[in-house]
């Protein structure tokens, strides 16, 4: 079955936007005016995942690029990466678990928990211009809350 998707941008709770930093990394920084056009547009796909009342399984691809955020172990640590896929086969309803994030939404604030690594979240640093990463703590220094803005298809 074709997967249902929508286009969006994400900003962290400090209003930092996400932009490409090299071919396989995202970073978070404050953007204004015309610079806002640099922010990445995600294709958020609604995929199969474990049944839960407050978690919606999604995959986060970069719009019109064959890149998806994925979670893998690197040096024994859960790590966020951008992974290249075959565009003929993605997105799909049954995404591999490393591509799946549980979207948790409370009062229009979104968290993205790795399905592969429970309690690890897409995170940004307080500091400007730092990589987006997978963090194992919530409510600490690092930021795990995001807002979503729809982008016209």
């Amino acid at each position: 079955a074709p997967v249902r998707s929508l286009n969006c941008t994400l900003r962290d709770s400090q209003q930092k936007s996400l932009v490409m930093s090299g071919p396989y990394e995202l970073k978070a920084l404050h953007l204004q005016g015309q610079d806002m056009e640099q922010q990445v547009v995600f294709s958020m796909s609604f995929v199969q995942g474990e049944e839960s009342n407050d978690k919606i399984p999604v995959a986060l691809g970069l719009k019109e690029k064959n890149l998806y955020l994925s979670c893998v172990l690197k040096d024994d640590k859960p790590t966020l990466q951008l992974e290249s896929v075959d565009p003929k086969n993605y997105p799909k309803k049954k995404m591999e678990k490393r591509f799946v994030f549980n979207k948790i939404e409370i009062n229009n604030k979104l968290e993205f928990e790795s399905a592969q690594f429970p309690n690890w979240y897409i995170s940004t640093s307080q500091a400007e211009n730092m990589p987006v990463f997978l963090g194992g703590t919530k409510g600490g220094q690092d930021i795990t809350d995001f807002t979503m803005q729809f982008v016209s298809s």
Epitope: A1, L6, E51, V58, N108, F150
Partner: antibody, heavy 120, light 107 residues
Amino acid sequence: QVQLVQSGAEVKKPGASVKVSCKVSGYTFSRYWIEWVRQAPGKGLEWIGEILPGDGNINYNEKFKGKATITADTSTDTAYMELSSLRSEDTAVYYCSTIYYDYDQGFTYWGQGTLVTVSS
Amino acid sequence: DIQMTQSPSSLSASVGDRVTITCKASQDIDRYLSWFQQKPGKAPKSLIYRVKRLVDGVPSRFSGSASGTDYTLTISSLQPEDFATYYCLQYDEFPYTFGQGTKLEIK
């Protein structure tokens, strides 16, 4: 509270067009799909299509492509469905409904329905 | 298109009875299944979504369950206001499709 208020009943001649409106209040318009459903007299429910006002995404039932055109005006929190080239078999009650953008909540709220009668 | 085969098409029951209505999907719908109640001349009313989650304000005598591609709506103890027509809906795949309806009548 959430409300979906639809425009009033219409009587149209075959070949004419009609535009049904669905004005919503009580929630963030852009974040919910507006669904359109029809019910012919004495019959069941049939899905026509949907629009996500936040990004203009529209999905149609193939059966209604060319018959229904769905739009939304975010400045007035109103969705519209225009039906063209009306025929007697388009006589039905047309409903709008809502579903959260991530599809999790089902068709939770419904408008009161708009009866469209096509008669010469 | 996904077919939703709803049964029975009509059902007579008495106040206090336990009633079950079934929808069978022609393929996997990933639990994107809702149930609605409709009374004559009124808009449908949402009862249950994602198979078993009750919409706010819906009495707990209504419940939903699933086994494979079979989905069931149960009313544990019928009340006078429950006599109506019930529809299931799959909203997993376009076009979304409804069951043909079950008319629940007073015996």
